[in-house]
């Protein structure tokens, strides 16, 4: 609404920078051939670029990325008993961000 | 993959808690009848519950919510000239979170 402005503080832009986000560890990352297992933990924290830029021609993009392998447990239930296996999932953390020009879509040839 | 576990640190669960997220200020929040304007800032930071819980029957939900009015600018370009107006948008911040049981979907009657 355009009224009752007195108590409203000025909105500050969410600048383009890294923020902590939650990444769900998909079972497909662990094993594409089998669905009868659980992954622990089901989600982890990652650093990702977010926020917005001054105009629509630029987007908040990572300029530096780091791959981080983490160890998870793959828990299979075999004859009602859990079998634990260790698996490595590679997470992608964004280390630095920048408002970058969005490349115009190339014409399909 | 199930190999090269030596350098992988144990994955830590992204616990259910408030995290800073980016909220895009939709133009529909300001004016549903007119599309010929910009909103500044286009996005702001909000606090939101995220993370995961111990099992699938529970979800990370806010237990305490606060509404926060903020002042944005509605920018119309009329005959190549900007006209600024002030508008208030009410943001929702999550103050506290909890892993809560997911209520079973009620049967449609």
């Amino acid at each position: 609404s355009l009224g009752s402005l007195t108590i409203a503080e000025p909105a500050m832009i969410a600048e383009c920078k890294t923020r902590t986000e939650v990444f769900e560890i998909s079972r497909r990352l662990i094993d594409r051939t089998n669905a009868n297992f659980l992954v622990w933990p089901p989600c982890v924290e990652v650093q990702r670029c977010s926020g917005c830029c001054n105009n629509r021609n630029v987007q908040c993009r990572p300029t530096q990325v780091q791959l981080r392998p983490v160890q998870v447990r793959k828990i299979e239930i075999v004859r009602k008993k859990p079998i634990f296996k260790k698996a490595t999932v590679t997470l992608e953390d964004h280390l630095a961000c920048k408002c970058e020009t969005v490349a115009a879509a190339r014409p399909v040839t | 993959s199930l190999g090269s576990l030596t350098i992988a640190e144990p994955a830590m669960i992204a616990e259910c808690k408030t995290r800073t997220e980016v909220f895009e200020i939709s133009r529909r929040l300001i004016d549903r009848t007119n599309a010929n304007f910009l909103v500044w800032p286009p996005c702001v930071e909000v606090q939101r519950c995220s993370g995961c819980c111990n099992n699938r029957n529970v979800q990370c939900r806010p237990t305490q919510v606060q509404l926060r009015p903020v002042q944005v600018r509605k920018i119309e370009i009329v005959r190549k000239k900007p006209i600024f107006k002030k508008a208030t948008v009410t943001l929702e911040d999550h103050l506290a979170c909890k892993c809560e049981t997911v209520a079973a979907a009620r049967p449609v009657t």
Partner: antibody
């Protein structure tokens, strides 16, 4: 007190470029629009273009497109104008001036001006 | 583009005189007209905006009126410090200035 402080006078060679600044103080930089105006020796005033610092959007007088480039730095409350491929025709005093984009009675009026920056193009 | 024609281009007057400066637009300006005073070596100074609104800090001897294409600036009693060049400025459609009226001592 509203103040627009412009950079100093410039003596430049033909074909060169010059970038001048206009530092704003005494008001909220992003709540106003910045204009640039040219005044040739003994002549009247000519509007060059406008920048909306809040959203980094520019508008130019057709005559100055390709000649002037307007930018703004919100962090330092400073507007800039770069003039390229200078000729003797560009020798003039250049002013920055602000206008309010809020639709009140004083909307769009240049109510505060910089002191002016003289550019002399000479070989 | 709207053109503004100011008349006269040079006006000689004495201290205490009532002075009237004219500005004519090539099309309707819808009252979006302002007047500026410029002294030698100085930046223009806003006197009147939206045809007849006196800018804060400007003496009340300055007044403006007009509509459509025809506008005037009046100085009810000329002071020596009023000797300057006066420009009209339209901001209804784009931005244009008149060529100016130079006010000098008779």
């Amino acid at each position: 007190e509203v103040k627009l402080q412009q950079s100093g006078d410039e003596l430049v060679r033909p074909g060169a470029s010059v970038k001048m600044s206009c530092k704003a103080s005494g008001y909220t930089f992003t709540d106003y629009v910045m204009h640039w105006v040219k005044q040739s020796p003994g002549q009247g005033l000519e509007w060059i273009g406008t920048i909306i610092p809040l959203i980094d959007t520019t508008s130019y007088n057709q005559k100055f497109k390709g000649k002037a480039t307007l930018t703004a730095d919100k962090s330092s409350n400073t507007a800039y104008m770069e003039l390229s491929r200078l000729t003797s025709e560009d020798s003039a005093v250049y002013y920055c001036a602000r206008t309010s984009p809020y639709y009140y009675s004083s909307y769009d009026v240049m109510d505060a001006w910089g002191q002016g920056a003289s550019v002399t193009v000479s070989s | 583009n709207i053109q503004l024609t100011q008349s006269p281009s040079l006006l000689s007057a004495s201290v205490g005189d009532r002075v009237t400066l004219s500005c004519k637009g090539s099309q309707n300006i819808n009252n979006y007209l302002a007047w500026y005073q410029q002294k030698l070596g100085e930046a223009p100074k806003l006197l009147i905006y939206k045809t007849n609104n006196l800018q804060t800090g400007i003496p009340s001897r300055f007044s403006g009126c007009g509509s459509g294409t025809d506008y005037t600036l009046t100085i009810s009693s000329l002071h020596s410090e009023d000797l300057a060049t006066y420009y009209c400025y339209q901001y209804d459609n784009g931005y244009t200035f008149g060529a100016g009226t130079k006010l000098e001592l008779k």
